[in-house]
Interface confidence: medium
């Protein structure tokens, strides 16, 4: 970059990149200022004037330094089975998460949830695994010997059989052991 060139807009050395928070405008052939998060380019730069930035309008945002013609629209309001964990502001999009008992079946690229689904339930003989499916849904695993689950639930894990001094009925995957009364 020639030493005498410091303030935007300026013509860079051909093929060289502009500095941080600047962009190369192909039409003006200039390095020009980007707009800060929460703003957008109202007027693009020319050879003699820099980018004119303006604040994003209501329900719109930009999250990065940019030269966007318009701000991005915030995602629509969270649905009844979601909770808003981050509000829509000029600098960030709204983020919705699923309420308890639900998982996100369809995420947006920004990490918000577009569609929540009820968590799967594990039936008798199966407990909820410690890890989740890639989509966040519950994974069920068969109860190992010595453990059981007698519920249909999206939260219950396999529990150990009770330990009896005298066993009346041995437990299995879906029922607990039954102890004989002590005489």
């Amino acid at each position: 970059l020639p030493a005498q060139v410091a303030f935007t807009p300026y013509a860079p050395e051909p093929g060289s990149t502009c500095r941080l928070r600047e962009y190369y405008d192909q039409t003006a052939q200039m390095c020009c200022s980007k707009c800060s998060p929460g703003q957008h380019a109202k007027v693009f730069c020319t050879k003699t004037s820099d980018t004119v930035c303006d604040d994003c309008e209501a329900s719109m945002y930009t999250q990065v330094w940019n030269q966007f013609r318009t701000c991005l629209s915030c995602s629509s309001s969270c649905t009844t089975d979601q909770v808003e964990i981050r509000a829509c502001t000029k600098q960030q999009n709204r983020v919705c998460a699923c309420e308890a008992g639900r998982y996100c079946a369809l995420k947006t690229h920004s990490g918000s949830c577009r569609q929540c689904m009820r968590l799967s339930k594990c039936g008798p003989g199966f407990g909820v695994a410690s890890s989740r499916a890639p989509n966040g849904n519950v994974l069920c695993k068969a109860c190992a010997p010595g453990t059981f689950s007698d519920t249909t639930s999206s939260t219950d894990v396999c529990r150990p059989h009770r330990i009896c001094s005298i066993l009346a009925i041995p437990g299995n995957a879906s029922t607990d052991a039954v102890c004989a009364p002590e005489s």
Epitope: P14, G15, Q26, K47
Partner: antibody, heavy 116, light 107 residues
Framework: QIQLVQSGAEVKKPGASVKVSCKAS????????MSWVRQAPGQGLEWMGW????????TYADDFKGRFAFTLDTSTSTAYMELRSLRSDDTAVYYC?????????WGQGTLVTVSS | EIVMTQSPATLSLSPGERATLSCKAS??????VSWYQQKPGQAPRLLIY???NRYTGIPARFSGSGSATDFTLTISSLQPEDFAVYYC?????????FGQGTKLEIK
């Protein structure tokens, strides 16, 4: 390294069309505009216009409006120059060139010969 | 359109001599002038951009000066490989235009 590789020489009859390609490599294609320059045999350089490689919007010099079309395929980092209704005075070497303010990289040129 | 007029059309000099090539614009183009060298059968090569900035890798014997309408390319001590055609071009306003060229030949 940065390269602009153009398609090979063409011999066409008057009235025909020709499409010259210019494949870019070694840099981010959509950052720099692509200019097109014509040079008739033994003559100087003529700026035909350019295409904004991010938006795809072309700009043509007055003498090159109508029969000329600049297009892009950003998926392959290739710019195209199409010339319709060829005439004998279109015989020239056609160059693609990166940028506008100080054109720093040029294709090797494509000779288009129009002859009946 | 802006007309770029180069002079002389042909310049005959010997290796080691100083070459001064002129380019005049019909209107003010600020400093939006580039200089290119072209040898037979080759594409042009960028030498100077912004009227006075030497492009990367260009030898120091090449220098550019001027602003507004009068521009000069100077080659301080000609080398055998410098004999070629030189073009100036403006990129200030559409349509961008080139001069007709100056042929630098060995005397």
């Amino acid at each position: 390294q940065i390269q602009l590789v153009q398609s090979g020489a063409e011999v066409k009859k008057p009235g025909a069309s020709v499409k010259v390609s210019c494949k870019a490599s070694g840099y981010t294609f959509t950052t720099y505009g692509m200019s097109w320059v014509r040079q008739a045999p033994g003559q100087g350089l003529e700026w035909m216009g350019w295409i904004h490689t991010y938006s795809g919007v072309p700009t043509y010099a007055d003498d090159f409006k109508g029969r000329f079309a600049f297009t892009l395929d950003t998926s392959t980092s290739t710019a195209y120059m199409e010339l319709r209704s060829l005439r004998s005075d279109d015989t020239a070497v056609y160059y693609c060139a990166r940028g506008l303010y100080g054109v720093d990289y040029w294709g090797q040129g494509t000779l288009v010969t129009v002859s009946s | 359109e802006i007309v770029m007029t180069q002079s002389p059309a042909t310049l005959s000099l010997s290796p080691g001599e100083r070459a001064t090539l002129s380019c005049k614009a019909s209107e003010n183009v600020v400093t939006y002038v580039s200089w290119y060298q072209q040898k037979p059968g080759q594409a042009p090569r960028l030498l100077i951009y912004g009227a006075s900035n030497r492009y990367t890798g260009i030898p120091a014997r090449f220098s550019g000066s001027g602003s507004a309408t009068d521009f000069t390319l100077t080659i301080s001590s000609l080398q055998p490989e410098d004999f070629a055609v030189y073009y100036c071009g403006q990129s200030y306003t559409y349509p961008y235009t080139f001069g007709q060229g100056t042929k630098l030949e060995i005397k």
